[in-house]
């Protein structure tokens, strides 16, 4: 499985620091958690919390760790072999077609519809039509009503056709 990697995903080149472990590439590839040296002779470990690689690779740099945005919570930190896992905060979700941001979940449904499913970090609530024949909040008017100036004043019905 090969990930699509863009230049901006690559961490800035670093000289092999003493704490970075080296090993030899196997068939030109380095294991997860490492990248290959410029001369192709060594595998250099990624820096914990800064960069990572998830697969056997011949990358010159490890991939930069993602930082969770505001509105997201960090589920698990970045390790040398796995990127940070971020999740939308409670009450928000990430849509498949706009993964760049968390969106607010709806809090209710239009009248005549019912909520199915809860707000999760990956899905909004859904509102589905009540089955026909169910009572809608018990306020089915027999005839049209005139506007009342305040919600508390009873309406005076008059016969109107739509």
């Amino acid at each position: 499985e090969s990930a699509l990697i863009t230049q901006q995903d690559l961490a800035p080149q670093q000289r092999a620091a003493p704490q970075q472990k080296r090993s030899s590439p196997s068939e030109g590839l380095c294991p997860p958690g490492h990248h290959i040296s410029e001369d192709g002779r060594d595998c250099i470990s990624c820096k914990y919390g800064q960069d990572y690689s998830t697969h056997w690779n011949d990358l010159l740099f490890c991939l930069r760790c993602t930082r969770c945005d505001s509105g997201e919570v960090e589920l698990s930190p970045c390790t040398t072999t796995r990127n940070t896992v971020c999740q939308c905060e409670e009450g928000t979700f990430r849509e498949e077609d706009s993964p760049e941001m968390c969106r607010k979940c709806r809090t209710g449904c239009p009248r005549g519809m019912v909520k199915v499913g809860d707000c999760t970090p990956w899905s909004d609530i859904e509102c589905v039509h009540k089955e026909s024949g169910t009572k809608h909040s018990g306020e089915v008017p027999a005839v049209e009503e005139t506007v009342t100036s305040s919600p508390g004043t009873p309406a005076s019905p008059c016969s109107l056709s739509g």
Partner: antibody, heavy 121, light 107 residues
């Protein structure tokens, strides 16, 4: 008879906000949700969201989430739709419509006359 | 989201002709399908709700049928005043969605 009367045409600059009003008469304002639907010139109808004038509860289409706010003033039976961070693609006729949820199926039974919002620099 | 596909996108017929417009939903929406008529420069007007119920005041030449995913609006005898664009709309699930419209013209 039932009527929804909207405010007049608006011309706005990109980045600005617009607030359209919709005054209801001929029925109990709080008994029916008000929805907003827009239509760009020569295009189809696009649902923006709904508002329950009784509870002030709202729900917006994800496309408009964060940019649209629907409110109401029950004392004057008026609903409002405010759209912010306007861009040229928001140039359209904006309609309010009454959502009739009584009976066998919900539908928009009455519509406002529409408000043309033009976004131009 | 539920996609609503209308066909044809436009049609031309003679006065007195029987005209049929179809609307297909991307998933089952039971009977929660409405039809609207929109004349140039005017707001849409409800014709049919719940797939087949005629809105009060709408001429009897308009009728609707269907359930599940396939729906039809029929004008039994086209009149000059029926020149308009017709839209279907599902009210089964939010976000509420409309078909792309069918423009009806007189030959």
């Amino acid at each position: 008879q039932v009527q929804l009367v909207q405010s007049g045409a608006e011309v706005k600059k990109p980045g600005a906000s617009v607030k359209v009003s919709c005054k209801a008469s001929g029925y109990t304002f709080t008994s029916y949700d008000i929805n907003w639907v827009r239509q760009a010139t020569g295009q189809g109808l696009e649902w923006m969201g709904w508002m329950n004038p009784n509870s002030d509860n709202t729900g917006y289409a994800q496309k408009f989430q964060g940019r649209v706010t629907m409110t109401r003033n029950t004392s004057i039976s008026t609903a409002y739709m405010e759209l912010s961070s306007l861009r040229s693609e928001d140039t359209a006729v904006y309609y309010c419509a009454r959502w009739n949820h009584y009976g066998s199926g919900s539908h928009f039974d009455y519509w406002g006359q529409g408000t043309l919002v033009t976004v131009s620099s | 989201d539920i996609q609503m596909t209308q066909s044809p996108s436009s049609l031309s017929a003679s006065v007195g002709d029987r005209v049929t417009i179809t609307c297909r939903a991307s998933q089952s929406i039971s009977i929660y399908l409405n039809w609207y008529q929109q004349k140039p420069g005017k707001a849409p007007k409800l014709l049919i709700y719940a797939a087949s119920s005629l809105q009060s005041g709408v001429p009897l030449r308009f009728s609707g049928s269907g359930s599940g995913t396939d729906f039809t609006l029929t004008i039994s005898s086209l009149q000059p005043e029926d020149i308009a664009t017709y839209y279907c709309q599902q009210s089964y699930k939010t976000p509420l969605t409309f078909g792309g419209g069918t423009k009806v013209e007189i030959k």
